[in-house]
Interface confidence: low
């Protein structure tokens, strides 16, 4: 009786179970009664990541540098291009489409993750103790300076966006 | 000084295809983002999408399946063509530009105004 | 989308009094916000960017401030030029979302 269902790795045609094409291969012919599954290796920019039945190799994505992508890992038969985005910019969407440029972060708010091909700049706003008066893509959040330690004492109280401003201790005669 | 300048119909039967340009003038479409921007009638003001100085584009979710932004460098300008227009995409059209998170929107367009009627 | 949620949604108010607009943010936005003017004539201005940096040619009465997910735009003495539609705008992540938009009309 011919089967219905197939093991792994297999498929149903005409009536009998062929053995699917391994990655990177693609579908020449089904197999017979007497012939196995006929397969052949995808061209160097072409690939196939599973088991599969198809009669085309997918091709390679391209790492179109008019949208400031370049390759971050060659595709091989089995595997797909990956693509990341040039220095200063991130991938738009989980596919990486396209790239825009990474955020500063803003007086008042430091750096917590500097921005990767893939993700943003993420900023966070400057804890009481610290700050930052600049408009940067890499720098923290700075701690107030210290006035103690210099001898000094504090003549203007510091913000999230500006450091404490020291100054001589009055002395007394 | 930076200026951009809209242009296009004024009048757009449904179901027809809407194509705008915004000329530019003072800086180059081939730096920066170029922005679509329309306000509604009701006033509310819709962001559509941009194309980037490497011809990058945007679209915002809504409006994906019917629109598209390109560019002419050679002209200085950019384009939005909407496809498939009801009604409800009466409003007037503005070209922005941006180029720093720290300077925002800078330069906008006077808006060309822009009916669906048959 | 992040939502902006402006109020109030009309003003009247006189000549030389100081007015107030807010715009609260339903996600993060880190700053990136902008107020812009737009005339009866329907030309649009930036006022303010980064959420309290002025923005060229634009009058010191107009300053932005922010306080957590809130962002206001304050104009002090107000002149007979500023009657006009006030809108926020978050450029933090893409689609940009506007604010529904002041309407500041002469008492």
């Known amino acids: 009786e011919p089967p219905t269902a197939c093991r792994e790795k297999q498929y149903l045609i005409n009536s009998q179970c062929c053995s699917l094409c391994q990655p990177g291969q693609k579908l020449v012919s089904d197999c017979t009664e007497f012939t196995e599954t006929e397969c052949l290796p995808c061209s160097e920019s072409e690939f196939l990541d599973t088991w599969n039945r198809e009669t085309r190799c997918h091709q390679h994505k391209y790492c179109d540098p008019n949208l400031g992508l370049r390759v971050q890992q060659k595709g091989t038969s089995e595997t797909d291009t990956i693509c990341t985005c040039e220095e200063g910019l991130h991938c738009m969407s989980e596919s990486c489409e396209s790239c825009v440029p990474h955020r500063s972060c803003l007086p008042g708010f430091g750096v917590k993750q500097i921005a990767t091909g893939v993700s943003d700049t993420i900023c966070e706003p400057c804890p009481v103790g610290f700050f930052s008066n600049v408009s940067s893509a890499f720098e923290k959040c700075r701690p107030w300076t210290s006035c103690e330690t210099k001898d000094l004492v504090v003549q203007q109280a510091g913000t999230n966006k500006t450091d404490v401003v020291c100054g001589p201790q009055d002395r007394q005669r | 000084e930076v200026k951009l300048q809209e242009s296009g119909p004024s009048l757009v039967k449904p179901s027809q295809t809407l194509s705008l340009t915004c000329s530019v003038t003072?800086?180059?479409?081939?730096?920066?983002?170029w922005n679509w921007i329309r306000k509604f009638p009701g006033n509310k003001l819709e962001y559509m999408g941009f194309i980037s100085y490497s011809g990058s584009t945007y679209y915002t979710p809504s409006l994906k399946s019917r629109i598209s932004i390109t560019r002419d460098t050679s002209k200085n300008q950019f384009y939005l063509q909407l496809n498939s227009v009801t009604t409800e995409d009466t409003a007037t059209y503005f070209c922005?530009?941006?180029?720093?998170?720290?300077?925002?929107?800078?330069?906008w367009g006077q808006g060309t105004t822009l009916t669906v009627s048959s | 989308d992040i939502q902006m949620t402006q109020s109030p949604s009309s003003l009247s108010a006189s000549l030389g009094e100081r007015v107030s607009l807010t715009c609260r943010a339903s996600h993060e936005i880190s700053g990136y916000l902008s107020w812009i003017q737009q005339k009866p004539d329907g030309t649009i201005k930036r006022l303010i960017n980064a959420a309290s940096t002025l923005a060229s040619g634009v009058p010191k009465r107009f300053s932005g401030s922010r306080s957590g997910s809130e962002y206001s735009l304050t104009i002090n003495s107000l002149e007979s030029e500023d009657f006009a539609d006030y809108y926020c705008?978050?450029?933090?992540?893409?689609?940009?979302?506007f604010g529904g938009g002041t309407k500041l009309e002469i008492k």
């Open positions: 922005a530009r941006f180029r720093r998170y720290d300077d925002g929107v800078d330069y």
């Open positions: 003072g800086d180059s479409v081939s730096s920066g983002y």
């Open positions: 705008l978050q450029y933090s992540s893409y689609p940009w979302t």
